[in-house]
Amino acid sequence: LTCLGGFASPGPVPPSTALRELIEELVNITQNQKAPLCNGSMVWSINLTAGMYCAALESLINVSGCSAIEKTQRMLSGFCPHKVSAGQFSSLHVRDTKIEVAQFVKDLLLHLKKLFREGQFN
């Protein structure tokens, strides 16, 4: 199948709703975490104030075979205006510290909750 069309949808999701859905998914991940998330995989830490959505995706996309974060990876791909592939790092991404996926998710969740409270849906 080579001809691909858009998935049917009732219409664009408002940014506030999209952000809330991402927060809910991250909450779900943190609450349902039993064993170490993604077998304790390490990812690059990111600057949460600089081009955060693409940077978060660039970091998490390098984790493969972890079903717990697949939905998050899909959601973040919609939050980033350019296509992100594994091993790709934009100039916004400072690669100096690696942290566990579980900590990455917690840090991202805290920051997104703060943005949501402040009404920063852009």
């Epitope: 691909l4 069309g5 858009g6 998935f7 664009p12 999701v13 940014p15 999209a18 952000l19 104030t49 600089a50 081009g51 955060m52 959505y53 693409c54 791909s77 919609g78 939050f79 205006p81 350019h82 296509k83 592939s85 790709q88 934009s90 100039s91 916004l92 009404g119 920063q120 849906f121 852009n122």
Partner: antibody, heavy 118, light 109 residues
Framework: EVQLVQSGAEVLKPGATVLISCKVS????????MHWVQQAPGKGLEWMGR????????KYAPKFHDRVTLTADTSTDTAYMELSSLRSEDTAVYYC???????????WGQGTLVTVSS | QAVVTQEPSLTVSPGGTVTLTCRSS?????????ANWFQQKPGQAPRTLIY???NRAPWTPARFSGSLLGGKAALTLSGAQPEDEAEYYC?????????FGTGTKVTVL
């Protein structure tokens, strides 16, 4: 050399549907998101939506979401934009554009003029 | 839906400096809006000047620079040339869609 070549100008009646193609060369279409932009005569630019040609996943602007359909044929490296229920205010130039981090919207098609007139 | 506003028109003297701004109705513009700036001349397709807030496209002259200024995206043209006379548009990303600015007509006079 990266090129985006769009189909030719169209003159259509209100209520009709237009399909514009954007044939790319110099890169693989599945490696990038393809965006579409509208520009009415003497007016500004308006983002219509984008498609990930790899899996067909789309994002549409609220204004266009119920009338626009973006598709891609990966076998021919061609993106398509279909706009239905045309009205006179849809008279515009439509551009396809390649977006990637290292030069967002860096490459544009030449534009396709669509004239809607009864 | 957000509205992205630019100055309708600005005039700059040859060799002079002018700053164009891009304001979001939803609040301060941030790096997560991935601001883009375009130049468009009559009868031509737009041409990308700045992407990701402050990155120049390979063909963009050094006299153009992008930044965040007072909660807005800004494009500064230092040392204006006659060929810089054009319409300039910004575009901001809002989590899942772009919105283009209203456009600024820059006259070099």
């Amino acid at each position: 050399e990266v090129q985006l070549v769009q189909s030719g100008a169209e003159v259509l009646k209100p209520g009709a549907t237009v399909l514009i193609s954007c044939k790319v060369s110099g890169f693989t279409i599945t490696d990038y998101y393809m965006h579409w932009v509208q520009q009415a005569p003497g007016k500004g630019l308006e983002w219509m939506g984008r498609i990930d040609p790899e899996d067909g996943e789309t994002k549409y602007a609220p204004k266009f979401h119920d009338r626009v359909t973006l598709t891609a044929d990966t076998s021919t490296d061609t993106a398509y934009m279909e706009l239905s229920s045309l009205r006179s205010e849809d008279t515009a130039v439509y551009y396809c554009t390649r977006y990637d981090y290292y030069g967002p919207f860096a490459y544009w098609g030449q534009g396709t003029l669509v004239t809607v007139s009864s | 839906q957000a509205v992205v506003t630019q100055e309708p028109s600005l005039t700059v003297s040859p060799g002079g400096t002018v700053t164009l701004t891009c304001r979001s109705s939803t609040g301060a513009v941030t790096t997560s809006n991935y601001a883009n700036w375009f130049q468009q001349k009559p009868g031509q397709a737009p041409r990308t000047l700045i992407y990701g807030t402050n990155n120049r496209a390979p063909w963009t002259p050094a006299r153009f620079s992008g930044s965040l200024l007072g909660g807005k995206a800004a494009l500064t043209l230092s040392g204006a040339q006659p060929e810089d006379e054009a319409e300039y548009y910004c575009a901001l990303w809002y989590i899942n869609h772009f919105i283009f600015g209203t456009g600024t007509k820059v006259t070099v006079l």
